[in-house]
Amino acid sequence: QFPRQCATVEALRSGMCCPDLSPVSGPGTDRCGSSSGRGRCEAVTADSRPHSPQYPHDGRDDREVWPLRFFNRTCHCNGNFSGHNCGTCRPGWRGAACDQRVLIVRRNLLDLSKEEKNHFVRALDMAKRTTHPLFVIATRRSEEILGPDGNTPQFENISIYNYFVWTHYYSVKKTFLGVGQESFGEVDFSHEGPAFLTWHRYHLLRLEKDMQEMLQEPSFSLPYWNFATGKNVCDICTDDLMGSRSNFDSTLISPNSVFSQWRVVCDSLEDYDTLGTLCNSTEDGPIRRNPAGNVARPMVQRLPEPQDVAQCLEVGLFDTPPFYSNSTNSFRNTVEGYSDPTGKYDPAVRSLHNLAHLFLNGTGGQTHLSPNDPIFVLLHTFTDAVFDEWLRRYNADISTFPLENAPIGHNRQYNMVPFWPPVTNTEMFVTAPDNLGYTYEIQWPSREFSVPE
């Protein structure tokens, strides 16, 4: 959402979020690190191209032309400098002058040593319990953001991990149309469209950076869960990793796992949609998880096959009209899991990413809640690994990522909601090792061709 320094009456009224870096001569004297040439305060660039007609409520949602409903000036950083005040480096760079390349390795969770597994679990738990040092979340829409008295900004602190959950919730929430009116649900700024992969890529990158900074461990990396096993068991659902099944309630996590103590945020949908409030930092009930337990839907009781990944990587077009969840021959829609692994759209199909979520059969299978289950992180790092392999194979061909007429939030140059500072889909449509400072340690299955008899 927004830096704590910008959650003020003055910043919100002025529309300027350009915090100081080192204001030696007093407040406002080093906006965006301008005194050291790191950046400057400039007008926000927001995508104004048309979106598809399935969203008919222009002017009613704070997420439109993000982030202009809140701020119209932000820091534009020079060179490899980055961040809300140009005080950090772009992904893949480090050092005081952001001139040292860095490459971290994301590895299979199951391949980590016992120590590394334990370190990762403890780091996640620390992120759940550590207040985000930079960002605060809005608990009201823009028209109510200054509170009933017009002088009390409606923002809250939130933990690093819950911020990760909140940003996802905010991107998928319904459009509130007013008290007594039904909220509009045919909108999603991070799923069912071309931005699915780029949005989730930045989402992970932000969490990874936040955890690196929390630990002050620049080489910390998020591992992945290779969910394409074809099995009907969750191989990472053990107490030393993501938590086994509770013996007392098959939908809960074992009390021997730290994750059994986690409580979810953003679960009060009824309130958000009828009162127009936003999810806040209040924690609620436990994570629910019942892998392979949905007996009513046998198709989601088994994880994707290894060959499903090999097949989806042969779909050479990134996306295809209508750039939605019914696109056919679209790599994005295939890996997202609305098409079968060969790219053919079928409304009955749930494959790859979607199937992995639904297999978890609980918190992780509900879009507005899913990041509350930390398996979400591992599921999406694997999805991102598939995306990065596609980018490598097809030379990051962005030509079929639409500039306009995608679902709202999904145009190529749209600033991904609700990330700050503004970051476009294009910026994430690049090969990670060369451009974003991370790589995957992974072997891809080669497609097996069966000879017809």
């Epitope: 040593s113 630990l215 461990e217």
Partner: antibody, heavy 119, light 108 residues
């Protein structure tokens, strides 16, 4: 280039306190955690823990809780180690080392500060 | 907690000879092992990281090998300035560092 300059040797009586400093230069102090390592005379190296120089949050190794305090002053890019209720067995060289290039090893070290506790 | 055991405790060799120092971990540390050299009155100096990578400015006569639980530091041809104490190190849980007890390399 990265440099860590520690304060000079200290001679203290049992029960007293000591505060040693480690001034960093050549990098952004608040970007990298600072570790503290102890080496008793003729002995090996022992990790005492580290301080997050961004948040000030310290993490202590087993055996280094209670009398040992890590702190810092970001305005002068300096980390501090304070030891209270000194005992003879605290006699050692204390090193600071930032977690700079990687979290897996320590590639820059201060020159060390000898603390001698003797009556 | 992982324990690192170095052997031998003392190694007596002459300049020009080959030195082989061993470090054994009580359980696998993958390839996350480093070697340091410490001379009297000086701070430790990083020689090798990730089991086999030479740190900046370290001469080619120093090499590291091994993975899992068994690691070796080799000095192909000893120079007079190489006589010192050598420590192996791994990063234990929660960003703490564990060191071996050291091997003293002395002139024969």
């Amino acid at each position: 280039q990265v440099q860590l300059v520690q304060s000079g040797s200290e001679l203290k009586k049992p029960g007293a306190s000591v505060k040693i400093s480690c001034k960093a230069s050549g990098y952004t102090f608040t970007s990298y955690a600072m570790n503290w390592v102890r080496q008793a005379p003729g002995q090996g190296l022992e990790c005492m823990g580290w301080i997050n120089t961004n948040t000030g949050n310290p993490t202590y190794a087993q055996g280094f809780t209670g009398r040992f305090v890590f702190s810092m002053d970001t305005s002068v890019s300096t980390a501090y180690l304070q030891i209270s209720s000194l005992k003879a067995e605290d006699t050692a060289i204390y090193y600071c080392a930032p977690r700079y290039s990687s979290s897996w090893y320590l590639d820059y070290w201060g020159q060390g500060t000898l603390v001698t506790v003797s009556s | 907690e992982i324990v690192l055991t170095q052997s031998p405790a003392t190694l007596s060799l002459s300049p020009g000879e080959r030195a082989t120092l061993s470090c054994r971990a009580s359980q696998s540390v993958s390839s996350y092992l480093a070697w340091y050299q410490q001379k009297p009155g000086q701070a430790p100096r990083l020689l090798i990281y990730d089991a086999s990578n030479r740190a900046t400015g370290i001469p080619a006569r120093f090499s590291g090998s091994g993975s899992g639980t068994d690691f070796t530091l080799t000095i192909s041809s000893l120079e007079p300035e190489d006589f010192a104490v050598y420590y192996c190190q791994q990063r234990s849980n929660w960003l703490m560092y564990t060191f071996g007890q050291g091997t003293k390399l002395e002139i024969k």
